[in-house]
Interface confidence: low
């Protein structure tokens, strides 16, 4: 009987003979078993027990070099070799052709647009430092302690001030290079800039000159003021600010030419610096004339505040604006400085947050918009800058006037709050390509509704459906309004609703979509070739 033993290939040592001279059936009896199948990288070697049997086996040491060459040169082998070589090259060329066809036919990845930092998320305005911080603590050092909060909102820029020295209506006592000592020192400002940079928050400085006075631009001394602004731009750019805001430009004579000049200074320093202009105007033609002469200017206005809060009218305003501005970058807000609650009833705040974060452009908010801060609910507080409600002690004037759900503290505890919705939307806005720079297509969904798609190339797509009405509505999504590149699927997953109660992540049939009063839905669906 022969005994099968398994030998690891690494342990098999070949003897000193050249490979072609090694005996295939040596007298020692170490013969390769023809039946010895390979198993897990091991070779079965049959050890012959009967030496006589092994010795009797004929010795064969393979072909000599001359014999091998003679056989290899025979017509049969030559033909076989040529056939194999031809097959190899045909196979190779076939694979190459296949690869070329696949590459040529595959849809091109769309080239990403140049993205400036203000394209990547929201801006947050703090026009009144003291109101923002409360408890009479409104200074730059205190604001530094609130940067963590701004980080948690995932906003990209802080629009600060004005904080410069300004004696009401007195040009001589207005110094755009000096920080009002009530707000702190230049050192405090530098320290704030450093901390903000570490948290990836850009700082935009408001340089509206006569912010405490009647006319923001001292209407009679425009040239003097314009020179002051030019000097201030250069000074603060050197100090490290990321941009500037000037408001009430409808009160500035020759605003377009001044803005063009200031834009040149700002962009001349770095393309990464931003100029924001604000106007109280809601007139599209006036807005467009300001934009026409200033490439890259971000303009905040009261344009959307005229929407009358109906779906059709809002859709019409948005689409008109986007069509008129072409492919230039927009900003979205309801005013140049005021809170959303100045224009909207409480039940529409969530809807507008969802809309502002998902329209193509930069959403711009005022401090307090994220919690629905409402001056009207705080007796004695100024409409334009009510105290920020951090917690229930933020408004000690009238005990019990502030309940937990009105405050940052209370809303932070509640995943269903307006603040939590703001944080979620801000997070999505800053990381999803379709929301960052995707195409926009509005389409019909029925009366009272405003719906649109955001999509970028082969990335995940987003569908927004907004019910501005105070009755529940069925959405009849008219996909026929959409180009082929933005077609609707039968189902889309619910990313979030502005109302509680829907199961997030669940697929919704778009043909049977029903929205609650004042409900907004953000749905997502994959690209399909």
């Amino acid at each position: 009987m022969s005994q099968d033993t398994e030998v690891d290939m690494k342990e098999v040592e070949l003897n000193e003979l050249e490979p072609e001279k090694q005996p295939m059936n040596a007298a020692s009896g170490a013969a390769m078993s023809l039946a010895g199948a390979e198993k897990n990288g091991l070779v079965k070697i049959k050890v012959a027990e009967d030496e006589a049997e092994a010795a009797a086996a004929a010795k064969f040491t393979g072909l000599s070099k001359e014999e091998l060459l003679k056989v290899a040169g025979s017509p049969g082998w030559v033909r076989t070799r040529w056939a194999l070589l031809l097959l190899f090259w045909l196979g190779w060329l076939g694979m190459l052709a296949g690869a070329v066809v696949i590459i040529v036919r595959a849809p091109r990845c769309r080239e990403l647009p140049a993205q400036k930092w203000w394209h990547t998320g929201a801006l947050y305005r703090i026009g009144d430092l003291q109101a923002f911080q409360g408890h009479g603590a409104g200074n730059l050092a205190g604001l530094k302690g609130r940067l963590d909060y701004l980080s948690s909102l995932k906003v990209k820029g802080l629009v600060l001030g004005p904080i410069h020295k300004n004696q009401k209506d007195d040009v001589a006592q207005t110094d755009l290079l000096q920080i009002d000592p009530n707000f702190g020192s230049k050192e405090d400002f530098d320290s704030l800039l450093q901390s903000a940079k570490k948290k990836s928050i850009r700082v935009i400085l408001d340089l509206t000159p006569n912010y405490r006075g009647e006319n923001s631009w001292f209407s009679t001394q425009v040239d003097t003021v314009a020179t002051k602004v030019k000097d201030a731009l250069e000074f603060w750019l050197q100090a490290g600010v990321d941009g500037f805001q000037v408001r009430d430009i409808e009160n500035l004579k020759d605003a377009s030419s001044f803005l063009a000049e200031w834009q040149n200074i700002t962009k001349g320093f770095s393309e990464d610096r931003l100029l924001i202009a604000g106007t109280n105007s809601s007139d599209l033609q006036q807005i467009l004339s300001l934009l026409e002469s200033n490439k890259d200017l971000l303009l905040t206005s009261s344009y959307l505040s005229d929407s009358g809060s109906t779906g059709e009218h809002t859709k019409s305003l948005v689409t008109q604006y986007l069509n008129a501005t072409g492919n230039r970058w927009c900003s979205w807000s309801l005013s140049q400085a005021r809170l959303l609650t100045s224009f909207l009833p409480a039940q529409l705040l969530r809807l507008y947050q969802l809309m502002l974060f998902t329209l193509p452009g930069t959403p711009v908010f005022s401090y307090g918009d994220e919690i629905g801060l409402d001056a009207a609910a705080l007796p004695g507080q100024p409409m334009e800058a009510p105290v920020m409600l951090w917690d229930e002690s933020s408004f000690p004037d009238i005990p019990g006037a502030v309940s937990a759900n009105m405050t940052v503290k209370g809303q932070s505890e509640d995943p269903g709050s307006l603040l939590s919705l703001f944080r979620r939307l801000s997070d999505q806005r800053s990381k999803e390509r379709s929301l960052l720079h995707g195409d926009f297509h509005a389409f019909s969904a029925g009366p009272g509704l405003f719906s649109y798609i955001r999509h970028w190339d082969q990335n995940e797509r987003f569908l927004v459906v907004l019910n501005f009405g105070d009755v529940g509505l069925s959405a009849g999504l008219q996909a026929s309004d959409l180009p082929a590149s933005a077609s609707l699927p039968a189902k889309a997953d619910l990313l979030l609703s502005t109302q509680p109660g829907r199961e997030e992540g669940s697929p919704l049939e778009l043909e049977r979509l029903k929205l609650e009063p004042h409900e907004g839905l953000l749905l997502r669906f994959p690209y399909a070739a």
Partner: antibody, heavy 119, light 106 residues
Framework: EVQLQESGPSLVKPSQTLSLTCSVT????????WNWIRKFPGNKLEYMGY???????YYNPSLKGRVSITRDTSKNQYYLQLNSVTTEDTATYYC?????????????WGQGTLVTVSA | QIVLTQSPAIMSASPGEKVTISCSAS?????MYWLQQKPGSSPKPWIY???ILASGVPARFSGSGSGTSYSLTISSMEAEDAATYYC?????????FGAGTKLELK
């Protein structure tokens, strides 16, 4: 210091109603969110719902309308009712209060009460 | 609802060993929260806002992650760390928990 204490029967028959009370000391239930959470024998935790400072409620949809959370502000207590119980509802029930505020997180839990559903 | 999947379900580690527990969310969450529970006790807040240690938590613990993928790490296992750890999200209602990771001492 905030303390929460659950109380109620430890044995409930199938199809009956499970009722638990959470007594709160050191904080007022008219502030914040007051939750019920349960832990099944296999260690799985399930959020059941809350009653808020204003009395508004939220219930986990998985409980299919069987759950109700109420409160009595004068006693500083809030309550859980779970109808039509089955053996699947056997769990340790916790009342809990969480506070999340910027860079703060507190979660106060009761010690838990084991409720067995059995005939 | 957001489903949190924790792994491993059970693990054992020797004193001094590095331990990592993972938690994966079915959709993106802004932050992850971690609880520690020992037999006979209620769960305790352990790590919040993904990486901030709750009061009294030893510095050998750390948390990291973003989007849908988060983890809790113990740089050097100690006997008192043996417990069940749960991840939890506060992103949206219903609040949800991972199934827990039971960490035992080898």
């Amino acid at each position: 210091e905030v303390q929460l204490q659950e109380s109620g029967p430890s044995l409930v028959k199938p199809s009956q109603t499970l009722s638990l009370t959470c007594s709160v000391t050191g904080d007022s239930i008219t502030s914040g969110y007051w939750n019920w959470i349960r832990k099944f024998p296999g260690n799985k935790l399930e959020y059941m719902g809350y009653i808020s400072y204003s009395g508004s409620t939220y219930y986990n949809p998985s409980l299919k309308g069987r759950v109700s959370i109420t409160r009595d502000t004068s006693k500083n207590q809030y309550y859980l009712q779970l109808n039509s119980v089955t053996t699947e509802d056997t769990a340790t029930y916790y009342c809990q209060r969480h506070v999340i505020y910027d860079y703060t997180w507190f979660a106060y839990w009761g010690q838990g009460t084991l409720v067995t559903v059995s005939a | 609802q957001i489903v949190l999947t924790q792994s491993p379900a059970i693990m054992s580690a020797s004193p001094g060993e590095k331990v990592t527990i993972s938690c994966s969310a079915s959709s993106s969450v802004g932050y992850m929260y971690w609880l520690q529970q020992k037999p006979g006790s209620s769960p305790k807040p352990w790590i919040y806002r993904t990486s901030i240690l709750a009061s009294g938590v030893p510095a050998r613990f750390s948390g990291s992650g973003s989007g849908t993928s988060y983890s809790l790490t113990i740089s050097s296992m100690e006997a008192e760390d043996a417990a069940t750890y749960y991840c939890q999200q506060y992103q949206s209602y219903p609040l949800t928990f991972g199934a827990g990771t039971k960490l035992e001492l080898k």
